[in-house]
């Protein structure tokens, strides 16, 4: 008799996919026509990458570090109208894209909460959370809250209010924090609350670092849901090395958790890497006009038209990512265990009862690693086969589909490895 | 124009009940938080409870907590506040008041008020 | 709670004075104060939020200002209209209170 079905885990939309930052409207859109209105024009290329909610803002009036010219319920005008945004909801609503709202007070300001008293500014979110949930967002961000003195009572009370018009509503903190025992004491007490930080971004990038941070995360979060990124708002390129961003995505799209990008991520997008760039919002390259001023200075490479017409590129490898990591059981859900592996190398196995198995195979360093996959730690649940299909590579040169023999297997520099098995009772 | 009119008062005995009423007009009111405030005679104006424009959050002074509740319905743009177990020390004219939707809280605009007098 | 005094409960001032009429808070509330008028017939009016900011409206000669804990409303040059009595609030945490009132008469 066929073994019983293991039965599925509860499934919030967040967990079926990756969330997209849009931090700054203008920017995303390019020089000068960043609005509501044109955000809307955009929203097949966000289907085109499967991404599963928009964390959209701040969009609120906000005059810099000013109490009594902040407004969380109007929408600047430079953004457009509240009519706009309604209208940006439906369309995103029809394309299976969740958006979420960033209510940072004083994004304009130095600090995000202003300097002053605290109490009076939460009482005016609560209200803003009311609102907007009415108005049909799905969810709220709210950044630096290391800021906010009793962030975590703050927090409680906004989920409350957030869960409490929806348990389909979502809840994302930001921190700057790296700290893990400050991540853990505000995850407490919020049990449904995604917090975005700086954690991973500590890093010294190497396969054995980052192992030891993935599993002392997950150990001290529990059961809980996790969120991977390396900060709470910036870009890939602001702290990884170039030569790692094709193997962080792939880190963070098969990770146990939701990922989450900032624009840009997905083509390799740098802080500041043109000239009269603000660092914190580098216009989208969405193709080669995307910065007149300059002729010349953007290749056809570095925008979306050039890596949309590129297998090899990161852009497509984002999407094959993305599209796997919303459809197959064992990366929507599945158990996560790592296992010893060549020094440099970080390597895992995410699987789901008898569904398609996967193995997660990172060389971190500079040179071509062996593999070395010891599979002696894992549970039976999770044994290692002889060999795997290759899914994908992050480096050019391999055939997708290709039998691979896992004794045998071999890394290039900075390669990661996504490979798949099926289940064998 | 903003418009906030206060009704409902009147002569109640002590431990009676009274619902007040305030229509507002010219603004959206879904939009706004609403207050009552009462002011009792010749003392000076004392914050009573708050509702948010979805009536979400709920706030209360401790004098009266448990005894009066504030409530609204938005498509009549009607505030309320229904007082119960009512004391000699109720006795006020009672104002509703719009709450600004900037972050520096205020009082906005105010109705003309209305008197309850607790006595028997 | 947080306790607001205003020290002086009545006021004599000639039209055209400039008068200023004083309110503290028991703690820091971090320029949340608010002042209101109240005519004689009742009528409750906003003149200045966060301090310092006039209400739309509100004629130029009020001014507010202060910091931490003490704060002032001035009037520059005093008309008969201003005849009334005049409340801070503190808006920065709840319950919202307010100060026990100056009542401004003509001498």
């Known amino acids: 008799r066929a073994p019983r079905c293991r039965e599925l885990p509860a499934q919030k939309w967040w967990h079926t996919g990756a969330l997209y930052r849009i931090g700054d409207l203008q920017a995303f859109q390019g020089h000068g026509s960043g609005n509501l209105a044109g955000l809307k024009g955009r929203l097949d290329y966000l289907s085109s990458l499967k991404v599963k909610g928009l964390v959209l803002g701040p969009l609120h009036k906000n005059q810099k570090d000013d109490v009594a010219q902040t407004d969380l319920l109007q929408i600047d005008p430079n953004f457009g109208s509240k009519e706009d945004f309604d209208n940006l909801l439906q369309s995103a609503k029809k394309k299976s894209i969740r958006v979420i709202l960033d209510l940072t007070p004083n994004y304009r300001g130095e600090n995000l909460w202003f300097s002053t008293q605290v109490d009076s500014v939460a009482t005016k979110v609560k209200d803003a959370l009311e609102f907007w949930l009415q108005a049909g967002v799905d969810g709220f961000q709210v950044r630096d809250i290391e800021n906010l003195k009793d962030a975590s009572s703050f927090l409680a009370e906004w989920e409350n209010i957030t869960k409490g018009f929806s348990e389909d509503r979502l809840l994302i903190a930001g921190t700057n924090s790296s700290d893990l025992q400050q991540i853990v004491s505000l995850l407490e007490s919020n049990k449904d609350l995604l917090l975005t930080s700086s954690y991973l971004s500590d890093s010294s990038f190497t396969g054995e670092h980052t192992k030891s941070l993935v599993t002392q995360y997950l150990n001290a979060t529990g059961n809980r849901w996790c969120s991977w990124s390396l900060s709470q708002a910036g870009l890939l390129t602001s702290f990884l090395p170039a030569q790692l961003l094709r193997l962080y995505q792939l880190m963070l799209f098969t990770l146990p958790g939701t990922p989450v990008f900032s624009y840009g991520d997905e083509i390799g997008l740098k802080a500041a890497a043109l000239p009269g760039q603000p660092v914190e919002a580098p216009v989208m390259l969405w193709d080669e006009s995307s910065f007149p001023d300059i002729p010349g200075a953007v290749s056809a490479n570095m925008t979306v038209k050039g890596q949309s017409e590129d297998p090899g590129s990161l852009l497509s490898l984002f999407r094959q990512l993305s599209d796997q990591r919303s459809k197959e059981r064992s990366l929507l859900h599945g158990d996560f265990h790592t296992f010893s592996s060549g020094p440099g190398l970080f390597s895992y196995i995410r699987h789901w009862d008898q569904n398609e198995r996967f193995l997660v195979v990172l060389n971190f360093g500079d040179v071509g690693l062996s593999a070395g996959l010891q599979a002696s730690d894992l549970p039976a649940s999770a044994s290692l086969p002889t060999k795997a299909d290759l899914v994908l590579s992050t480096q050019p040169g391999r055939e997708e589909g290709s039998p691979l023999e896992l004794e045998r297997l071999k890394l290039e520099p900075h390669e990661g490895l996504l490979l798949r098995f099926p289940y064998v009772a | 124009d903003v418009q906030l009119v206060e009704s409902g008062g009147g002569l109640v005995q002590p431990g009676g009940s009274r619902k007040l009423s305030c229509a507002a007009s010219g603004f959206t009111f879904s939009t706004f938080g609403m207050h009552w405030v009462r002011q009792a005679p010749e003392k000076g104006l004392e914050w009573v409870a708050y509702?948010?424009?979805?009536?979400?959050?709920?706030y209360y002074a401790d004098t009266v907590k448990g005894r009066f509740t504030i409530s609204r319905d938005n498509p009549k743009n009607t505030l309320f506040l229904q007082m119960t177990s009512l004391r000699s020390e109720d006795t006020a004219m009672y104002y509703c008041?719009?709450?600004?939707?900037?972050?520096?809280?205020?009082?906005?605009?105010w109705g003309q008020g209305t008197t309850l007098t607790v006595s028997s | 709670d947080i306790q607001m005094t205003q020290t002086t409960s009545s006021l004599s001032a000639s039209l055209g004075d400039r008068v200023t009429i004083s309110c503290r808070a028991s703690?820091?509330?971090?320029?949340?104060l608010n002042w209101y008028q109240q005519k004689p017939d009742g009528t409750v009016k906003l003149l200045i939020y966060y301090t310092s900011r006039l209400h739309s409206g509100v004629p130029s000669r009020f001014s507010g200002s202060g910091s931490g804990t003490d704060y002032s409303l001035t009037i520059s040059n005093l008309e008969q209209e201003d005849i009334a009595t005049y409340f801070c609030?503190?808006?920065?945490?709840?319950?919202?209170?307010f100060g026990g009132g100056t009542k401004l008469e003509i001498k």
């Open positions: 609030q503190q808006g920065s945490t709840l319950p919202r209170t």
């Open positions: 509702i948010s424009g979805g009536s979400t959050n709920i």
């Open positions: 703690q820091d509330i971090s320029n949340y």
């Open positions: 008041a719009r709450e600004t939707t900037l972050l520096a809280t205020n009082f906005d605009y």
